[in-house]
């Protein structure tokens, strides 16, 4: 979390951001709050990019104004409008590009003053695992599937009973690219599984952590999943 | 088309007082402060300072505080580097510079000053 | 103040070769949040100065993947791969780690 302050001369007003990451060819958002202003005619929001000239978007008077817009930016850009009164100046940035990584800045005017704080955006791709009996196989064997990653995770198996256990050993994960020559997508299988014991399919990169649980008794096959952003601090 | 245009070369006496300025275009001009660098002869770049341009609070590196002064003229988006009781070590090509996060990101056209007696 | 100090001072090099330019402070310009501010400029003859790398190591936009900055600490370097005509001019250094912001001075970039 960072919390920014305005400078002096007149009056400064408190500005949050949360670092946050944004999944290549998916929407994302950048999270800004502020102390509200009850005109919104008062409020300006802009958001500014580290390394690019013009704007990211500009927000005045109620409305958009792109005409300073950069554009690398232009059609991808909007404020929640209806609620900047509220002080929430969050950014929603769609189809997240690989080069939409980096610093950000939230630098808002409202009637009370001015303030700003920064934001790091990472970006990368993350997607949730299924871990499955693989039938195929001649002996009991699990597979992991994810379809999207980026940067190349590390993939880690684990077991509720042989907790501590290293299954290297007797685990094989490829990544396979994907048609946009980016993400890659991630599969691993797991060799000699034993009956009654809950398996974890762990993927990580420096943006994501996904797991992948599945649970192997006589009579049947639970499965959970679940992704957790890394490094989502405010400011 | 984001531009800082600066007003012409100037020839003064010494003792005399000179006032340069720099228009900017194509941005928010109180978002970005605005900084002075200084560029003697064949030298190298000096940071003078810098002034905000929401609050207009200017703030002087130590070699240039006495008679040098940044002042704003918002609604016409311009800043303004005054420079009093001039010296002949003063003459030197001077550069207004939006800073945007820790940088210079553009800068002006630059202004000669000239002082000979 | 933090002093910059640029070698080469004047570089000659032939259009195609690799030049590389050297800057050195006389204190870490790492800064209490973790980051380096470390930048490069260019000015061209006649011209103001332009922004070319900020951060130690990131391009500015539209500056040409032939520039690549690196370093740490105290000691920094820019690389141009393959010169072109259009890259001759002055380069300089600047900090702004530390106040007040300061400038190298100087690497003459000519044609051999």
């Known amino acids: 979390l960072i919390i920014g302050f305005g400078i002096s001369g007149r009056h400064s007003i408190t500005v949050t951001t949360v670092a946050s990451a944004g999944n290549i060819g998916e929407d994302g958002i950048l999270s800004c709050t502020f102390e509200p202003d009850i005109k919104l005619s008062d409020i300006v929001i802009q958001w500014l990019k580290e390394g690019v000239l013009g704007l990211v978007h500009e927000f005045k008077e109620g409305k958009d104004e792109l005409s300073e817009q950069d554009e690398m930016f232009r059609g991808r850009t909007a404020v929640f409008a209806d609620q900047v009164i509220v002080g929430n100046a969050s950014l929603r940035l769609k189809n997240v590009q690989l080069t939409d990584a980096g610093t950000y800045k939230c630098y808002i005017i409202t009637s009370k003053g001015k303030g700003n704080a920064n934001l790091e955006y990472k970006t990368g791709a993350f997607s949730m695992p299924e871990v499955n009996v693989d039938y195929n196989a001649s002996s009991e064997t699990l597979r992991c599937e994810a379809p999207r990653w980026f940067p190349q995770p590390t993939v880690v198996w684990a077991s509720q009973v042989d907790q501590g256990a290293n299954f290297s050993e007797v685990s094989n994960t490829s990544f396979e690219l994907n048609s946009e020559n980016v993400t890659m997508k991630v599969v691993s299988v797991l060799y000699n599984v034993t009956i009654n014991n809950t398996y974890s399919c762990m993927i990580e990169n420096d943006i994501a952590k996904a797991t992948g649980d599945i649970k192997v008794t006589e009579s049947e096959i639970k499965r959970r999943s679940h992704l957790q952003l890394l490094n989502s601090k405010a400011s | 088309q984001i531009q800082l245009v600066h007003s012409g070369p100037e020839l003064k006496k010494p003792g005399e007082t000179v006032k340069i300025s720099c228009k900017a275009s194509g941005y928010p001009f109180t978002t970005y402060g605005m900084n002075w660098v200084k560029q003697a002869p064949g030298k190298g770049l000096k940071w003078m300072g810098w002034?905000?341009?929401?609050?207009?609070?200017?703030t002087y590196a130590d070699d240039f505080k006495g008679r040098f002064a940044f002042s704003l003229e918002t609604s016409a988006s311009t800043a303004y580097l005054q420079i009093n009781n001039l010296k002949n070590e003063d003459t030197a090509t001077y550069f207004c510079?939006?800073?945007?996060?820790?940088?210079?990101?553009?800068w002006g056209t630059g202004t000669t000053v000239t002082v000979s007696s | 103040d933090v002093v910059m100090t640029q070698t080469p001072l004047s570089l000659p090099v032939s259009l195609g070769d690799q030049a590389s330019i050297s800057c050195r402070s006389s204190?870490?310009?790492?800064?209490?949040?973790?980051?380096?501010?470390l930048h490069w400029y260019l000015q061209k003859p006649g011209q103001s100065p332009k922004l070319l790398i900020y951060k130690v190591s990131n391009r500015f936009s539209g500056v040409p993947d032939r520039f690549s900055g690196s370093g740490s600490g105290t000691d920094f370097t820019l690389k141009i791969r393959r010169v072109e005509a259009e890259d001759l001019g002055v380069y300089f250094c600047s900090q702004s780690t530390h106040v007040p912001w300061t400038f190298g001075g100087g690497t003459k970039l000519e044609i051999k």
């Open positions: 510079a939006r800073r945007s996060f820790w940088y210079f990101d553009v």
């Open positions: 204190q870490s310009l790492v800064h209490s949040n973790g980051n380096t501010y």
């Open positions: 002034i905000d341009t929401y609050s207009g609070v200017p």
